[in-house]
Interface confidence: low
């Protein structure tokens, strides 16, 4: 196995929920074999870890939800990479394996006595973020009847219940955003378009749907390319040169891409001096993420992106922005993140990182340049879904009993899945959370536009919406120049 | 987990090699959730199990190969299905998981003493046959540094060592047969072709290569469709109707398909009365398999297929054809197979199957209608590769020592992989077995043609070869009619 010792965030409880978040970026190509992950991530990583920990605290202090039952968690890092996520998922299922080892008489004590385990099994898993990774994790979890609720894995393939029975999500399938992207292309009469997608399930299936729908609408996808998110500069440059060769005819580039693929494209545009040459139409892997455009805003200007509608969660910020490294010890990645975020050394701390020369000032605060993860509402809704599913299961299996009755020891994954599929409740933003027969949720998208708002000031603005097949666009806003 | 209790074939030894063979057909769509497999298979299943058992006997009695070391095996059924194969692979790695559980103090005996395991870990895995399934298995095995040697998983994707480091194969990548198929299309000036592929890695990546190469050669792939091997009749009929709608222009149908997909197409042709309407060009998933055409020969006539060159292995037949259910007790599937093969009941036997009315006659023999698995040579070469890799590793780690020295206890998968990659030896058919930097083997294909040889007598005949980019075809043979 990898020599990397995997860090885990634990919270005790009567029932343990697993979670996979991309606490670190994916391994670079040369580090894939060691499964050595990249730098720590704030929005997709640390914020989601904290969302899990704090949401469980809120659930545990809610007397109407799972009374007399404490929810705990085991949070692991997926590094946005299949091999790492699979390795971590094996840790989730280890307990199931060992209990069946014992049944089969493969674990024996030297004196013939029985063994016991000191770790509670995982009843369900939240995440991971990436569709490709979620598929691999689901392939494993479903063998053990462990339900999985995703908060941002939107690939259409995951709707197939014959293949992914124990998979559910609080987000819609990408079939809908592919339709939205085609509707935007139609609206502006772009008949000749280049296409790029991220290698992997999210990009491939999304782009396939986009192409199929485009063909039906008479839109010519002139050239189509794919690239890995973690591809090297050379690969991105090569791709950009190909796209350049189709200018000016194919100025519009539809990108069904993960955020880091878009960032790779923007960086290549800078290297090749191609800012302003293309109009990018991006899927929700880009959405309104600043970590995609940071430092490459000029190249991104004009980009039109799809974003799942998810307002900021105020109570999360109230909690998160008070966190400090000397007190937040339950998050094992927090000190590493703090040093990375402020590029300083936590001198004298357990995880002091000597690569930073400057010592961290005690007046530092997360309020500085804070941006809440755009999928925060979905992460929280996924956790609440698991809680409501368990609550309904408890009500049905333990009528008139507060707490875990014998019928719920151990928790049967098949029954939990049934209960989860029937769950409906009011989500964190006031929207109804429910699941269709494929475990998918209904969805509504916002259409964003990345603009230069003033001299050297860039931002995403909302220029429209797509709701259940209906596209609304503020055309004047899309085509107006702000920086005058 | 599945309620199905999985059967395993064991052979004891100092070193245990795992193997995944499709002893049964894949689950039908309605049985996928239970992972309840289909009927027992002879060529792809039982013959491979017996090849493994007998090849290990030959290796163990060879004084020059691994002297003083006995190779044993643990053979599991993949059912040509990812979920089943993954479930079985988890059994292979169980031991690694448990040993690390103990290291981490997660397994304790009630009196505090230590526990011990009664099962040797698997050092490597042979198989499985399908590329899609092999990918899933590799994703898991590589986390535990367990080398995997495939005998028929030919997908191009598997050449990517950043993704599949512990994967090797004694067959070439499909990039080569895609090229061969394009060369055939070119040779006969078929400029307008329909395309079908099996959903899953083998079909998808193969068809992608076929399309890319076709485009470069100015061949128009008019329409392209995909279908699951285990899709229902309705799905196959729907696909055939689409193909029919492009007749007569797109008469040629290039099928980068697993054998059972081709069989599904032939069955749909029968239902829709489309025999003789298409000319099928099939990849090596079809090759010269009788289980593909059986009962649907008239629909398959004219089909041109690609087959990996692999002569029959005489010594295997000498062993296999003598097997009998009363004596062959080490193969736990043999009685089930015998009853299925001869459609009779082994009365009074442990695995007597009451669904058959007729009692098996003691004069039955496997010689009747015997066909050796077309991939037999590859299966055996894969097993020998593992043995030679271990032999070279032992020579290097235990110089001057016969048997397993301390440096090989336990066996380090990384070192074994290195040793395997450097392995070269004379294969079972006299060919050189070696691996390039991607773990791939060189390959040569035969071009087969399915013909009516006489009244109601059909067979595959060799009509050409493709060797390292050079296509040779006996055009007269391809277009001649035999049944006159």
């Amino acid at each position: 196995q990898s020599s990397e010792r995997r860090v885990v965030a634990h919270m005790p409880g009567d029932i343990i929920i697993g979670a996979l978040f991309s606490v670190h970026h994916q391994p670079t190509v040369d580090k894939v074999h060691e499964r050595k992950c990249g730098a720590v991530r704030e929005q997709y990583g640390i914020q989601r870890v904290e969302a899990m920990l704090h949401t469980l605290e809120r659930i545990n202090s809610d007397p109407t939800l799972l009374p007399n039952i404490t929810l705990g968690c085991e949070i692991r890092d997926s590094c946005w990479h299949s091999a790492v996520a699979l390795e971590q998922s094996i840790e989730f299922i280890r307990d199931s394996l060992i209990s069946s080892e014992e049944e089969e008489g493969l674990v024996r004590c030297v004196d013939g006595s029985s063994s016991f385990r000191s770790k509670k099994p995982i009843v369900g898993v939240i995440g991971p973020g990436s569709s490709s990774v979620a598929i691999q994790v689901q392939n494993l979890l479903q063998l053990f009847n462990i339900p999985q609720i995703a908060y941002s894995a939107t690939s259409m393939d995951l709707s197939d219940k014959t293949l992914f029975k124990y998979f559910m999500r609080v987000v819609p399938s990408d079939a809908q955003q592919a339709r939205a992207m085609v509707d935007i292309v139609k609206r502006y009469n772009w008949t000749y378009v280049s296409a790029v997608h991220t290698e992997g399930n999210y990009g491939e299936s999304g782009m396939e749907a986009f192409k199929d729908m485009s063909a039906k609408e008479g839109i010519c996808i002139a050239h189509s390319y794919k690239i890995y998110s973690n591809a090297g500069e050379q690969s991105f440059d090569k791709l950009l040169k190909k796209l350049r060769s189709h200018l000016p005819k194919a100025r519009v580039v539809a990108c069904f891409c993960e955020g880091m693929t878009v960032r790779g494209l923007l960086m290549a545009m800078r290297r090749l001096g191609l800012a302003g040459e293309f109009l990018l139409l991006g899927s929700d892997g880009w959405a309104d993420r600043y970590d995609v455009t940071d430092g490459y805003q000029r190249e991104a200007v004009g980009g039109i992106t799809i974003k799942l509608q998810s307002p900021d969660v105020k109570w999360f910020d109230d909690y998160y922005l008070k966190l400090r490294p000397e007190t937040n010890l339950r998050n094992p990645w927090f000190q590493e993140f703090w040093q990375h975020r402020f590029q300083c050394r936590l001198e004298g701390f357990a995880q002091e990182n000597s690569k930073y020369n400057k010592t961290c000032n005690s007046s530092l605060t997360l309020r500085t340049h804070h941006v809440q993860d755009s999928k925060m509402g979905f992460v929280i809704n996924a956790i609440y879904s698991m809680a409501y599913g368990l609550h309904n299961m408890q009500m049905s299996l333990c009528p008139g009993y507060a707490g875990l009755c014998d019928a719920m020891k151990p928790i049967d994954g098949r029954k939990l899945l049934d209960s989860l599929m029937k769950t409906n409740f009011t989500g964190v933003s006031g929207d109804m959370i429910l699941f269709d027969e494929n475990g998918d949720s209904p969805g509504r998208y916002e259409i964003m536009n990345f603009k230069e708002m003033g001299k050297d000031y860039f931002d995403y603005i909302n220029v429209g919406s797509w709701d259940n097949g209906e596209l609304k666009m503020d055309d004047d806003e899309v085509w107006s120049k702000k920086n005058n | 987990q599945s309620s199905e209790r999985r059967v395993v074939a064991h052979m004891p030894g100092d070193i245990i090699i795992g193997a995944l063979f499709s002893v049964h057909h894949q689950p039908t769509v309605d049985k996928v959730h239970e992972r309840k497999c289909g009927a027992v298979r002879e060529q792809y299943g039982i013959q491979r199990v017996e090849a493994m058992l007998h090849t290990l006997e030959r290796i163990n009695s060879d004084p020059t190969l691994l002297p003083n070391i006995t190779l044993g095996c643990e053979i599991r059924d993949s059912c040509w299905h990812s979920a089943v194969a993954l479930e079985q692979s988890i059994e292979f790695i169980r031991d690694s998981l448990i040993s690390s559980e103990e290291e981490e103090g997660l397994v304790r005996c009630v009196d505090g003493s230590s526990s011990f395991r009664s099962k040797k870990p698997i050092v490597g895995v042979i198989g499985p046959g399908s590329s899609s399934v092999a990918i899933q298995v590799q994703n898991l095995l590589q986390l535990f540094n367990i080398p995997q040697i495939a005998y028929s998983a030919t997908s191009m994707d598997l050449s990517d060592k950043t993704l599949f480091k512990y994967f090797m194969r004694v067959v070439p990548s499909d990039a080569q047969q895609a090229r061969a198929m394009v060369d055939i299309v070119k040779r006969y000036n078929w400029t307008y072709v329909s395309a079908v592929h099996t959903e899953g890695n083998y079909g998808e990546s193969g068809m992608e290569a076929f399309k890319d190469m076709s485009a470069k050669e100015g061949i128009c792939i008019a329409h392209s469709y995909k279908i699951y091997s285990n899709a229902g009749e309705q799905s196959f009929d729907k696909l055939l109707k689409k193909l029919r709608s492009h007749l007569p222009k797109a008469r040629v149908v290039a099928c980068f398909c697993e054998g059972m997909t081709v069989r599904g197409l032939l069955m749909a042709m029968r239902r829709l009365g489309l025999a003789g309407e298409f000319l099928l060009l099939g990849s090596d998933g079809w090759a010269d398999r009788y289980d593909v055409t059986d009962g649907y020969q008239r629909e398959a006539v004219g089909g041109i297929t690609i087959k990996l060159q692999s002569p029959d292995v005489k010594w295997f037949d000498d062993y296999y054809l003598k097997l009998r259910p009363e004596t062959n007790l080490r193969n736990p599937w043999f009685q089930e197979f015998w009853q299925h093969r001869f459609q009779c009941r082994l009365e009074g036997f442990a695995q007597e199957n009451s669904k058959y009315n007729k009692t098996c006659n003691s004069s039955l023999t496997l010689r009747t209608h015997h066909v050796q698995d077309s991939k037999m040579g590859f299966v055996i070469n894969a097993i020998y590769s593992m043995a030679y890799g271990l032999h070279n590793m032992q020579m290097s780690l235990c110089p001057g020592y016969a048997g397993l020295c301390d440096a090989m206890k336990p066996i380090d998968g990384r070192k074994l992989l290195d040793s395997l990659m450097k392995t070269n030896f004379t294969g079972v058919s006299g060919d050189m077995i070696l691996f390039d930097e991607n773990g791939d083997s060189p390959g040569r294909y035969e071009i087969m043609n399915f013909k009516e040889m006489g009244k109601d007598y059909f067979d595959y005949i060799n009509v050409g070869s493709w060797d390292n980019g050079e296509l040779k075809m006996d055009d007269d043979e391809v277009w001649s009619k035999k049944n006159n």
Epitope: - | S396, P399, G400, D406, A407
Partner: antibody, heavy 120, light 109 residues
């Protein structure tokens, strides 16, 4: 009985080249061993230089020895150590030793050593 | 490269007594450590390999222990013939290199 004998030592000028030979008797290298060179400056400790695997002639060097020293298996019973650009610091008794590995099993058979003196 | 630090440089003990020599590796070398005895004008003689395994023909009075970075050679029931210089040799598997300690001179009174 099994023994190793070093030869080729002597006086050499700074900047010079010298080749030492280790001859094994009672040992057939086809048994696959690691033949190594270790040196010891007068009154000082031992210093590992290099090993060669008699199976395939694979070599293993101390980082300081790479480039200037070359170990080779020259026949089924001899191993050589070629030394170039010699300086006074290379003055030492050079021992030939045999092990079952590059180092993890130690060296269980040693020659008596040959003295190399680098001096003008 | 790996560095082996041996202590003490010299030790004196009476016949029948016990001597302990320590060897520290700059990196973890697991159990890849050997101990040698060298007498003037002679080549070294292997005593212990793999940290604690006694070479055949070596008296059981010689005992090796330790793993990782800290190792010990203990000689009990000292005899006059044990007067010699003792060296540890560490093997660093990752770089396939060896290093010897500086040696410990044992004087037997």
């Amino acid at each position: 009985q099994q023994q190793l004998e070093e030869s080729g030592g002597g006086l050499v000028k700074p900047g010079g080249t010298l080749t030492l030979t280790c001859k094994a008797s009672g040992i057939d290298f086809s048994g696959y061993y690691y033949m190594c060179w270790v040196r010891q400056a007068p009154g000082k400790g031992l210093e590992w230089i290099a090993c060669v695997y008699t199976g395939d002639g694979g070599t293993y060097y101390a980082s300081w020895a790479k480039g200037r020293f070359t170990i080779s298996k020259t026949s089924s019973t001899t191993v050589t150590l070629q030394m170039t650009s010699l300086t006074a610091a290379d003055t030492a008794t050079y021992f030939c030793a045999r092990g079952s590995g590059v180092g993890s099993y130690g060296y269980n058979l040693w020659g008596q050593g040959t003295l190399v003196t680098v001096s003008s | 490269d790996i560095v082996m630090t041996q202590t003490p440089a010299s030790v004196e003990a009476a016949v029948g007594g016990t001597v302990t020599i320590k060897c520290q590796a700059s990196e973890s070398i697991y159990s890849n450590l050997a101990w040698y005895q060298q007498k003037p004008g002679q080549p070294p003689k292997l005593l212990i390999y793999r940290a604690s395994n006694l070479e055949s023909g070596v008296p059981s009075r010689f005992k090796g222990s330790g793993s990782g970075t800290e190792f010990t050679l203990t000689i009990s029931d000292l005899e006059c013939a044990d007067a010699a210089t003792y060296y540890c040799q560490g093997y660093y598997a990752i770089t396939t290199t060896n290093a010897f300690g500086g040696g410990t001179e044992v004087v037997v009174k």
